[in-house]
């Protein structure tokens, strides 16, 4: 028998520095977690102790903190090179700055193979990107060879900016011929490494003949066997075992997100490359693991540029940006409108001639807006200003919901109106009218939404049975502020871009902003 140790990360999202337990900015260093310096310590410790070790990343290193905003992926290549990753799969967020924003900082600079079997380049891009990413890579590990086959969510064109010259094929259809080819070349130990979410990971394990292990990402899935060491609640045991259609037991793993854990999976293969056993658990990278001094010193060196960036002007406002709780928790506020407009603008994707855009709606809990911005400082808006407005380091995500769920969400928005509670919703692409004289749960008297399948966008009444795409904070997608109905009833959830980054990009693009209160949210009394 031959034993392989797979160390894996996924959805690190720009958490190069250690973070607090909830993956936001580290405040009390003695209780902080993750970060590449700490990750390196643990990886090196395992590499020294065990003979056959692979360090793999399942995508979405890009996007999530000011590190990505400033360094645009150069930081990913630099520190992943320093940690000597063996392979990485492309995630949807790797395309956030377009194909050029992937090619130049990452694909050309990475000293490890970057993989995806289901992304096919066409047109002028085909020759430009040729060889910069691969469908698979065969790695010598000890006295054996291991094939790593990559895959990426086929929803990427709706979630990011891959452009028109990349085709995202069905994962299973694309993976099978690559695996078959490796098998004919006597590569009998094959890992599928990719970024399509836990449900697709399980399908790949079930359907792709010849895949021995699946290492996934995208859904931030936490798996654990035994008592979990932190706040994350396991979605299943680690590894999660799928019985394939041809009767094999295929381990599937993921390691939550944000570099908080290092996935640790030990696989035992027989001489024919069959998995005999698999066991392990994610390792919580808490403060009991010291940060590597040389990596930490490098982080501190790179940090300097970030501090300079946060005080630079992004754009100007010529109006007061009212982000006060007195406004945003009670009525339409122009800061809420600005943020929602930025959220929709960040999700403009013309992927279908029938639709002017794939999504038109935004909802945003008023309690998530933490500060106004005064225009009387020469109108200047900095990253620092925006960090005061959006201090929680969240993301603006894409969900699919039924109209009935949205109606429940808007009822929840005002079910205890007047107490300055955070669930009052700010909106974009939605016109809502509330009648507060009615009893809680029956206060929404009008709810119109902006059409997407139209050439001239207009507002139509919400249909209860229709499925709508909505952009919202990850906090709401996870049921925060009492929006349990969103968490329970959402049909799809894809994590999006860092909240501050979305707004800062919009302000930089617009140069001068002047958001108004324009009647998106109205109140009526009596019959409507």
């Amino acid at each position: 028998a031959w034993e392989l140790t797979i160390l894996h990360t996924n959805d690190v999202h720009s958490r190069l520095e250690q973070t607090s337990e909830d993956s936001s900015k580290c405040v009390n260093a003695s209780r902080c977690m993750g970060g590449v310096a700490r990750l390196f310590t643990k990886v090196q410790q395992i590499r020294r102790a065990e003979p056959n070790v692979l360090l793999l990343d399942a995508g979405d290193q890009y996007q999530g903190t000011i590190w990505f905003t400033v360094y645009k992926g150069a930081e990913v290549a630099h520190f992943m090179n320093a940690l000597r990753y063996d392979a990485m799969a492309l995630g949807n967020h790797e395309f956030d700055n377009g194909v050029e924003g992937l090619i130049e900082p990452l694909l050309k600079e990475a000293k490890f193979p970057i993989l995806s079997a289901n992304i096919k380049a066409k047109g002028p891009l085909a020759s430009q990107i040729s060889g910069l990413y691969l469908p698979y890579k065969v790695l010598p590990v000890g006295d054996e060879v291991v094939g790593i086959v990559g895959y990426t969510s086929k929803e990427t064109p709706f979630l990011s900016n891959p452009g028109t010259n990349l085709v995202f094929e069905d994962e299973i259809t694309a993976l099978q011929p690559e695996v078959d080819k490796l098998k004919t070349l006597n590569v009998n130990k094959i890992i599928a490494l990719g970024h399509s979410g836990f449900e697709m990971d399980k399908l790949i394990a079930q359907k792709v003949r010849g895949v021995d292990v699946v290492v996934g990402g995208h859904s931030n899935t936490f798996l654990y066997t035994g008592n979990p060491p932190s706040k994350e609640v396991p979605a299943g045991k680690y590894p999660f075992i799928v019985t394939s259609d041809d009767g094999r037991k295929v381990p599937v793993v993921q390691a939550y997100a944000f570099g908080k854990y290092l996935g640790y999976l030990k696989i035992e293969f027989d001489e024919r490359g069959n998995v005999i056993s698999s066991h392990g658990n994610p390792i919580l990278l808490n403060s009991s693991i010291p940060e590597d001094p040389s990596i930490k010193a490098d982080i501190n060196k790179w940090r300097i540029k970030l501090d300079n960036y946060s005080t630079q002007e992004l754009g100007k406002t010529i109006v007061y940006l009212d982000g006060s709780s007195q406004s945003c928790r009670f009525r339409e506020c122009n800061m809420g409108n600005l943020i929602c407009d930025a959220m929709i603008n960040n999700n403009l994707r013309h992927t279908d001639e029938m639709f002017w855009n794939h999504v038109s709606m935004c909802i945003l809990n008023g309690g998530g807006i933490r500060s106004p911005i005064d225009e009387r400082n020469n109108g200047t808006i900095t990253w620092e200003n925006l960090a005061a407005v959006l201090p929680f380091g969240g993301t603006f995500d894409l969900v699919q919901l039924k109209g009935s769920t949205l109606k429940k969400a808007f009822e929840h928005s005002v079910h205890r109106y007047g107490q300055s509670t955070g669930e009052f919703l700010q909106v974009g692409g939605i016109h809502v009218v509330y009648d507060l004289s009615r009893k809680p749960g029956d206060r929404v008297v009008k709810l119109d939404v902006l059409c997407t399948k139209c050439r001239v966008p207009s507002y139509d009444p919400l249909k209860m049975d229709e499925v709508y795409k909505v952009i919202l904070p990850n906090f709401l997608a996870n049921g925060g502020d009492g929006f349990q109905m969103i968490k329970d009833e959402l049909l799809r959830h894809d994590s999006g871009d860092q909240d501050i980054n979305v707004v800062s990009t919009y302000i930089s693009k617009m140069k001068v902003i002047y958001p108004a209160v324009e009647g998106r949210i109205k109140f009526s009394t009596g019959s409507h």
């Epitope: 003979p51 060889g131 000890g142 054996e144």
Partner: antibody
Framework: QVQMKESGAEVKKPGASVKVSCKAS????????MDWVRQAPGQGLEWMGD????????IYNQKFKGRVTMTIDTSTSTVYMELSSLRSEDTAVYYC???????????WGQGTLVTVSS | DIQVTQSPSFLSASVGDRVTITCKAS??????LSWYQQKPGKAPKTLIY???RLIDGVPSRFSGSGSGTDFTLTISSLQYEDMATYYC?????????FGGGTKVEIK
């Protein structure tokens, strides 16, 4: 700068064994695998195998399996290639070559001529 | 094993000429192809890896292209010092296999 210095020429009788050394310098020895390639007089290049200096893991060309052994000495940053049961057709220049992150050979040793003759 | 066929086996060209050498693999090798230059009595020198990535210090007149099974090494303007034998190598899978070589002579 990256350098691979190989041991001197050897003359061996058929059936004997030869052990060629390759001392690496100018980089972190354990960061890169080492390949061995040979070239018979007037012929092309032939890949023999690969060794990982971290753990001594080896991948051999089946053609040489059972006759070739690659080993390492991390204390001296040296890789060894031993070929046994020598025959006249093993007369060749033997090269070590470092592999880069993509497992493509990038830097080569100067070569060691091994002559097998009775 | 993957077979690699290199052509031509010999070519003669003038200084300043554009020269191309091709390698064809018996199956798709995933851009995992490198090119080497070997002068008489010397060790090979690596020029290109991953089909088109130039090794540091190699003159820019050398370039690589191709994907799948067909690959090309181009010398845009042949120089005297380029007189050598050129080899390609597939390193997609084990065992690694070389092309038979192309001897480039100056007319």
């Amino acid at each position: 700068q990256v350098q691979m210095k190989e041991s001197g020429a050897e003359v061996k009788k058929p059936g004997a064994s030869v052990k060629v050394s390759c001392k690496a310098s100018g980089y972190t020895f354990t960061d890169s695998n080492m390949d061995w390639v040979r070239q018979a007089p007037g012929q092309g290049l032939e890949w023999m195998g690969d060794i990982n200096p971290n753990n001594g893991g080896t991948i051999y060309n089946q053609k040489f399996k059972g006759r070739v052994t690659m080993t390492i000495d991390t204390s001296t940053s040296t890789v060894y290639m031993e070929l046994s049961s020598l025959r006249s057709e093993d007369t060749a220049v033997y090269y070590c070559a470092r592999t880069n992150w993509d497992y493509a050979m990038d830097y080569w040793g100067q070569g060691t001529l091994v002559t097998v003759s009775s | 094993d993957i077979q690699v066929t290199q052509s031509p086996s010999f070519l003669s060209a003038s200084v300043g000429d554009r020269v191309t050498i091709t390698c064809k693999a018996s199956q798709d090798i995933n851009s995992q192809l490198s090119w080497y230059q070997q002068k008489p009595g010397k060790a090979p020198k690596t020029l290109i890896y991953r089909a088109n990535r130039l090794i540091d210090g190699v003159p820019s007149r050398f370039s690589g292209s191709g994907s799948g099974t067909d690959f090309t090494l181009t010398i845009s303007s042949l120089q005297y010092e380029d007189m050598a034998t050129y080899y390609c190598l597939q390193y997609d899978v084990f065992p690694r296999t070389f092309g038979g070589g192309t001897k480039v002579e100056i007319k």
